[in-house]
């Protein structure tokens, strides 16, 4: 089992549209088949999963169960976006990059992007 | 509270196949990974199986791959595996357990059902 | 697979009494450990997560440390209600693989 560098921005702010785009880029110590991408949300000391995908490599990356998550990989490289934001959902957005097979398993986990979501103001009534 | 009761054990015969559930309340069960984990008469505990929060992915050891499935209904709040070509081996109390992240993001076995006993014998 | 070795298999203590059991990994797991305890007919309960976080409603007198392949289970001071089966696992991969346990007698 080895340990395993992830990079992601520090900072990201969502669209007005509630959506969110970072690279979660990882330090392929070995020739990697099987990779599966997890992005965690903490806020104060509660962690939950956001979305989860497991993809071979060269294919396309498939995030399952109704997933608010898409993402694109190349390489060493996953470009993730995050849909449907709102305010209450600004926080610390983990990318934890596992290499599934073949063995050695290897885990790596990014220092988290901030992502800050501003909910749009209502458009005000119009007279016309 | 959050509760997670199995059923489905039973005597069964080599060869056999037995589907067990676990209907779980007192929390949102779609927000989580669960799993089924056994311990053999002789006390070892093994993890047996995984599935993500909607069902897309799901993971086993060797000892069980090809044989067993997990799966769920979210809109029953249940947790299911079905085994087939049940071996003596196979002989144990199989729980279900909610998965929990830690401060580490990394999954443990935060909850689990009181079991039920599967015996696979002739 | 990572084999979890755990130490002693038995142990006989009085309460009041610290005691440790010690959980070895067959290769390097950094901090992903989890100790549980057991009880006679009961489903295993988490005490301890990432080598040394305390699971939610777990005393104090508990404690775990470690790091790598070496991870000890201390309670400083024990209770009637200790004596049970502790279980060391890692969470570092698959598959999760767990000890053989330390059952934990009354002297």
């Known amino acids: 089992c080895k340990a395993m560098h992830v990079a992601q921005p520090a900072v990201v702010l969502a669209s007005s549209r509630g959506i969110a785009s970072f690279v979660c880029e990882y330090a392929s110590p070995g020739k990697a088949t099987e990779v599966r991408v997890t992005v965690l949300r903490q806020a104060d000391s509660q962690v939950t999963e956001v979305c989860a995908a497991t993809y071979m490599m060269g294919n396309e990356l498939t995030f399952l169960d109704d997933s608010i998550c898409t993402g694109t990989s190349s390489g060493n490289q996953v470009n993730l976006t995050i849909q449907g934001l709102r305010a209450m959902d600004t926080g610390l957005y983990i990318c934890k990059v596992e290499l599934m097979y073949p063995p050695p398993y290897y885990l790596g986990i990014g220092n988290g992007t901030q992502i800050y979501v501003i909910d749009p103001e209502p458009c005000p009534d119009s007279d016309f | 509270e959050v509760q997670l009761v199995e059923s489905g054990g039973g005597l069964v015969q080599p060869g056999g196949s037995l589907r067990l559930s676990c209907a779980a309340s007192g929390f949102t069960f779609s927000s989580y990974t669960m799993s089924w984990v056994r311990q053999t008469p002789g006390k070892r505990l093994e993890w047996v199986a995984t599935i993500s929060r909607g069902g897309g992915y799901t993971s086993y050891p060797d000892s069980v791959k090809g044989r067993f499935t997990i799966s769920r209904d979210n809109s029953k709040n249940t947790l299911y595996l079905q085994m087939n070509s049940l071996r003596a081996e196979d002989t144990a109390m199989y729980y279900c357990a909610r998965e929990d992240y830690g401060s580490s993001y990394v999954h443990w076995f935060a909850y689990w059902g009181q079991g039920t006993l599967v015996t696979v014998s002739a | 697979d990572i084999q979890m070795t755990q130490s002693p298999s038995f142990l006989s203590a009085s309460v009041g009494d610290r005691v440790t059991i010690t959980c070895r990994a067959g290769e390097n797991i950094y901090s992903y450990l989890a100790w549980y305890q057991q009880k006679p007919g009961k489903a295993p309960k988490l005490l301890i997560y990432?080598?040394?976080t305390l699971a939610e409603g777990v005393p104090s007198r508990f404690s775990g440390s470690g790091s790598g392949t070496e991870f000890t289970l201390t309670i400083s001071s024990l209770q009637p209600e200790d004596f049970a089966t502790y279980y060391c696992q890692h969470h570092y991969g698959s598959p999760r693989t767990f000890g053989g346990g330390t059952k934990l007698e009354i002297k």
């Open positions: 990432n080598a040394r």
